[in-house]
């Protein structure tokens, strides 16, 4: 059977006026997954995102991540899109005060 990913979006200061947003998917099986940043619901070009390999996380499941840089104040325009085993979800960037955003998908 399949195990849905836990999706976690974080943000960190990049340079003045910009922030780096990172979307991590973990504890999923099988390893095939789509994880990408969308701007206004449209996927960013591959060369404007940084990608992590899909790696085993030690429990027979897998983990990966994707990151991009955005303008501070434009967080609402960006979502992390995840597709796994026929299910999909979108995950917003947390507001400045909150640095973690966890979702488990079934």
């Amino acid at each position: 059977g399949s195990v849905p990913p836990m999706v976690n979006v974080t943000r960190s200061e990049a340079s003045e006026g910009n922030i780096t947003v990172t979307c991590r998917a973990s504890s999923f099986y099988p390893r095939n997954i789509t994880l990408t940043w969308r701007q206004d619901g449209v996927s960013l070009s591959h060369d404007t995102q940084q990608w992590g390999d899909v790696l085993p996380d030690g429990n027979g499941t897998y983990q990966t991540w994707v990151a991009t840089r955005i303008c501070q104040g434009e967080e609402q325009r960006f979502t992390c899109y995840m597709e796994h085993s026929g299910n999909h979800s979108t995950h917003p960037v947390p507001s400045g005060n909150s640095h973690h955003h966890h979702h488990h998908h079934h």
Epitope: V42, S45, Q49, T79, P92
Partner: antibody, heavy 118, light 112 residues
Framework: EIQLQQSGPELVKPGASVKVSCTAS????????IYWVKQSHGKSLEWIGY????????ISNQKFTGRATLTVDKSSSTAYLHLNSLTSEDSAVYYC???????????WGAGTTVTVSS | DILMTQTPLSLPVSLGDQASISCRSS???????????LEWYLQKPGQSPKLLIY???NRFSGVPDRFSGSGSGTDFTLKISRVEAEDLGVYYC?????????FGSGTKVEIK
Amino acid sequence: EIQLQQSGPELVKPGASVKVSCTASGYAFTKYNIYWVKQSHGKSLEWIGYIDPYTGGTISNQKFTGRATLTVDKSSSTAYLHLNSLTSEDSAVYYCARPGSYWYFGVWGAGTTVTVSS
Amino acid sequence: DILMTQTPLSLPVSLGDQASISCRSSQSIVYTNGNTNLEWYLQKPGQSPKLLIYKVSNRFSGVPDRFSGSGSGTDFTLKISRVEAEDLGVYYCFQASYVPFTFGSGTKVEIK
């Protein structure tokens, strides 16, 4: 086949409101945003805003803030554009559109003509 | 708001001619992460617009290879290598790098 079916033409009085619908078919509705675009007669195109059907989140052109409300009904795969306090300036064709993987308006509805007249 | 200025407003052509439309943005539309959301649309009378080019230079599915897009920063160009009758209509450039998204005023390609 991916389609966006829009509601029919509307003739409304100044000061009234109107609700234009856009029903999606041929794909999973919550996978893609729905955009709304205005085209006044013989004029260029104007972006109104968009809604993410998965989260219900919206981003709008400030020019339309307070006058245009975007909503969705996931159960019927339908997006709505609600315009209030209409004036003759709002007489236009209103389009809904859907993005694709890397592009913004890959699929368009046929447009809904709204005429504001007393 | 970012102003998208298209030139010319009207472009009379003979079938088989090359046509070139310019679109200039009032500021750079390269986003912080390097993404440039610049698209071209063609609208024929009584029809919805149709997507031709996305992310500056990528042809949309089913668009003939006589259409090409180029440019960067603030200056963008759509070229039609050999105009055919089905290419007549109004062409719009569109930027979605910054909110509010904005369209150019349109270029009408018509028979000379």
